[in-house]
Amino acid sequence: DFGLDCDEHSTESRCCRYPLTVDFEAFGWDWIIAPKRYKANYCSGECEFVFLQKYPHTHLVHQANPRGSAGPCCTPTKMSPINMLYFNGKEQIIYGKIPAMVVDRCGCS
Amino acid sequence: DFGLDCDEHSTESRCCRYPLTVDFEAFGWDWIIAPKRYKANYCSGECEFVFLQKYPHTHLVHQANPRGSAGPCCTPTKMSPINMLYFNGKEQIIYGKIPAMVVDRCGCS
């Protein structure tokens, strides 16, 4: 699998992964004890057909061209978890691995 | 996890899974021996924030609102394989499980 990496200075218009730090403190999400911020990344850019398509299915739907099917869009194709320490609704402290918090790769699907 | 199922008569505008039969014969993909057609399904519809979001990450990116980040889009969140019999590039007959050929569920990511 392959995905483009960009930054705020990039001129790339195609689907790309960009850096983004999520700051829970700035959001006022104080039930999250740690981390207070983490590198989440995000996907942005255009999906011309065939470019960075994750699934053969995407190409097949394009071929079949059903009513209302939009083109593929730039979305996470590989994500990873982070460990978090937080209060649950019962005010118990939980330490756990929260899935799909970091975008590792972007693609068109 | 949860996702909406629709059909061609549905008035649902939100992200939904629609039925789609892919016909390899109609595409002229004659290197595929079997199946000649299969139920692939596809995703279509609008993604208002929070509706059917697969990942907490999607919500966090919306909160952080970085430059160029589009809203989430309606995309497969669960896919399954099908078994296929086909000719490879060396004209050998291959029988194998091809991943991500069927959309089982759609969501916003």
Epitope: E25, G28, D30, I33, A34, P35, N83, L85, E91, Y95 | -
Partner: antibody, heavy 124, light 107 residues
Framework: QVQLVQSGAEVKKPGASVKVSCKAS????????MHWVRQAPGQGLEWMGN????????NYNQRFKARVTMTTDTSTSTAYMELRSLRSDDTAVYYC?????????????????WGQGTLVTVSS | DIQMTQSPSSLSASVGDRVTITCKAS??????LSWFQQKPGKAPKSLIY???RLVDGVPSKFSGSGSGTDYTLTISSLQPEDFATYYC?????????FGQGTKLEIK
């Protein structure tokens, strides 16, 4: 910058109560545990307990549990430690300290900022 | 409660000396050990956390080591401003417990 400013010295009679304040500035007060530590004259440090201002969840040292209450006022970013039924051996400097997480594990933290201390003298 | 035994309780040394202070826990504390420096009339100041990590802004002449139950703080070249009392703290479990302190005096 991150700062903790404590209330001034107190003189109390045995059996009375004292309430020490710790005003935080330079950070999001509600999102960090505040701890209280005391030090008797010429003695070592003793941990009393902590509180999370966001939801008021606290954890006390059993030694003080019957006599101590930790509270916060999020509108003024102030933490309070009240100690009741004072005895002469409660004469000490009382410190507040912020718990800073350098990683996400439950014990992955240290005290990064301390208040200047409040001397409480218990004497008849 | 976990007992923290610090030694020596006092120590005389000269400017330029290398000194070592030790802290022994009554059970394995998984390297969740911090070291503090305290000067008379002042609040403690964090030096080392997680047994060997230096707090931002603390000079590198301070170093920590150890694991399990045995930990040490080393000051590589004593300066006049380093004469103070040093404490260890275990944060592996509640209640948090401090060592009784080591007073570092000028010889």
């Amino acid at each position: 910058q991150v700062q903790l400013v404590q209330s001034g010295a107190e003189v109390k009679k045995p059996g009375a109560s004292v309430k020490v304040s710790c005003k935080a500035s330079g950070y999001s007060f509600t999102g960090y545990f505040m701890h209280w530590v005391r030090q008797a004259p010429g003695q070592g440090l003793e941990w009393m307990g902590n509180i999370y201002p966001y939801n008021g969840v606290s954890n006390y040292n059993q030694r003080f549990k019957a006599r101590v209450t930790m509270t916060t006022d999020t509108s003024t970013s102030t933490a309070y430690m009240e100690l009741r039924s004072l005895r002469s051996d409660d004469t000490a400097v009382y410190y507040c300290a912020r718990r800073y997480y350098y990683d996400t594990g439950p014990a992955d933290w240290y005290f990064d900022v301390w208040g200047q201390g409040t001397l409480v003298t218990v004497s008849s | 409660d976990i007992q923290m035994t610090q030694s020596p309780s006092s120590l005389s040394a000269s400017v330029g000396d290398r000194v070592t202070i030790t802290c022994k826990a009554s059970q394995d504390i998984n390297s969740y050990l911090s070291w503090f420096q305290q000067k008379p009339g002042k609040a403690p100041k964090s030096l080392i956390y997680r047994a060997n990590r230096l707090v931002d802004g603390v000079p590198s002449k301070f170093s920590g080591s150890g694991s399990g139950t045995d930990y040490t703080l080393t000051i590589s070249s004593l300066q006049p401003e380093d004469f103070a009392t040093y404490y260890c703290l275990q944060s592996d479990e509640f209640p948090l417990t401090f060592g009784q302190g080591t007073k570092l005096e000028i010889k």
